[in-house]
Interface confidence: medium
């Protein structure tokens, strides 16, 4: 099996993890998508998921996790705000396609959260705190808590990640508090 690779994010407490999970637009636009954590020796645990079918540009918030699925860009945006040290771990985006196994998107995310310089959350990241406020109107979707253990060891198919590019601005239609729009789609 192909070795699964990881992309590592080293952040401080209080900061925001902001990642993009790109998918093949034609195949998966309306499919339900999820953000999972993978702990050693355990099945991937779903922390948040989009609605079923997934709605375009409609924020879904579960605690400090916000998911936004942009069908026209083939992009699931995942944000974890106000990070805590205990958020450290291995994460992945998946697409639910029952009865088949969930389809994993791109490399996994290795998140390492450390204490802020002054020990106070967000002490070195006030800009992100201001920019990525939690949307005032969000939906909480129901999703399977765990997926099959096969997802842990299964190699991903040849990349379907639409790893995108600079300068494709996304209009975040239901997110009134976001001041700036990311440049990459």
């Amino acid at each position: 099996a192909t070795k699964l690779t990881e992309e590592k994010y080293e952040l401080k407490e209080g900061q925001t993890l902001d990642v993009k999970c790109d998918y093949t637009l034609e195949k998966f636009a309306s499919s339900q998508k999820a953000w999972q954590i993978i702990r050693d020796g355990e099945m991937p645990k779903t922390l948040a998921c989009t609605e079923r079918p997934s709605k375009n540009s409609h924020p879904v918030q579960v605690g400090r996790i916000i998911l936004e699925d942009y069908h026209d860009h083939g992009l699931l945006r995942v944000r974890m705000v106000n990070l805590q040290v205990e958020d450290s771990g291995l994460y992945q985006c998946v697409i639910y396609q029952p009865p088949k196994e969930p389809h994993m998107l791109f490399d996994r995310i290795r998140l390492v959260v450390t204490k802020g310089f002054s020990g106070t959350p967000g002490s070195n990241e006030n800009s992100t705190q201001n920019v990525y406020k939690i949307p005032p109107t969000t939906t909480k979707a129901l999703c399977p808590l765990y997926t099959s253990p096969r997802t842990v060891t299964q190699a991903p198919p040849k990349s379907t990640a639409d790893v995108s590019t600079p300068d494709s601005e996304i209009n975040l239609t239901n997110v009134t508090d976001i001041i700036r729009v990311p440049v990459f789609n």
């Epitope: 790893v163 995108s164 300068d167 789609n185």
Partner: antibody
């Protein structure tokens, strides 16, 4: 292994045209949006243009808008940059680039192709 | 567009020394969208840091990034001979994506 190989550079007179190509391999090209970035001799880097995976979204730097056209052929795993009305200030090494899997930075670059605009 | 100003323009140091490179943005940039690149003569740029502080695959841990808002820093803890090159910062927070003018790290 991701590989990006540019070609098509050369010497052209002001007002002339040139078409650059970028051959991609080692990844599913049709699933990735792509970019052109250039670097004038002895100068810094400048983003030029980008195109989404299905060509639905196309963007240009103001300095090339109306003169350059980005396109792609997913069946051939190729990215193109058609450059018209070339000016001396377009002289540069042109790179095709792809961002990382989940972050907004150019992780993969070609070796570049030199375009010289001179009379 | 966001203008990124890098300083100093040239840094003259010896192998083993610590290098501190600065990148200042004309307006606030979320750290998720700030990257650093290394470029050697005749070569394409190489991604070092993304998200202001995360090292790209294969980058030695002597390279580290930090900062937020308008001020970002790339630090090379102990310069190796292969580290002498030009370094660029780049933002992808506001369209168009822009690069700093570069800092050349040369051997003293």
């Amino acid at each position: 292994e991701v590989q990006l190989v540019e070609s098509g550079g050369g010497l052209v007179k002001p007002g002339g045209s040139l078409r650059l190509s970028c051959a991609a391999s080692g990844f599913t090209f049709s699933s990735y949006s792509m970019n052109w970035v250039r670097q004038a001799p002895g100068k810094g880097l400048e983003w030029v243009s980008s195109i989404s995976s299905s060509s639905s979204y196309i963007y240009y730097a103001d300095s090339v808008k109306g003169r350059f056209t980005i396109s792609r052929d997913n069946a051939k795993n190729s990215l193109y940059l058609q450059m018209n009305s070339l000016r001396a200030e377009d002289t540069a090494v042109y790179y095709c680039a792809r961002r990382g899997g989940s972050y907004d930075a150019f992780q993969h670059w070609g070796q570049g192709t030199l375009v010289t605009v001179s009379s | 567009e966001i203008v990124l100003t890098q300083s100093p323009g040239t840094l003259s140091l010896s192998p083993g020394e610590r290098a501190t490179l600065s990148c200042r943005a004309s307006q606030s940039v979320s750290s998720s969208y700030l990257a650093w690149y290394q470029q050697k003569p005749g070569q394409a740029p190489r991604l070092l840091i993304y998200g202001a502080s995360s090292r790209a695959t294969g980058i030695p841990d002597r390279f580290s990034g930090s900062g937020s808002g308008t001020d970002f820093t790339l630090t090379i803890s102990r310069l190796e001979p292969e580290d002498f090159a030009v370094y660029y910062c780049q933002q992808a927070f506001i369209s168009p994506p822009t690069f700093g003018g570069g800092t050349k790290v040369e051997i003293k």
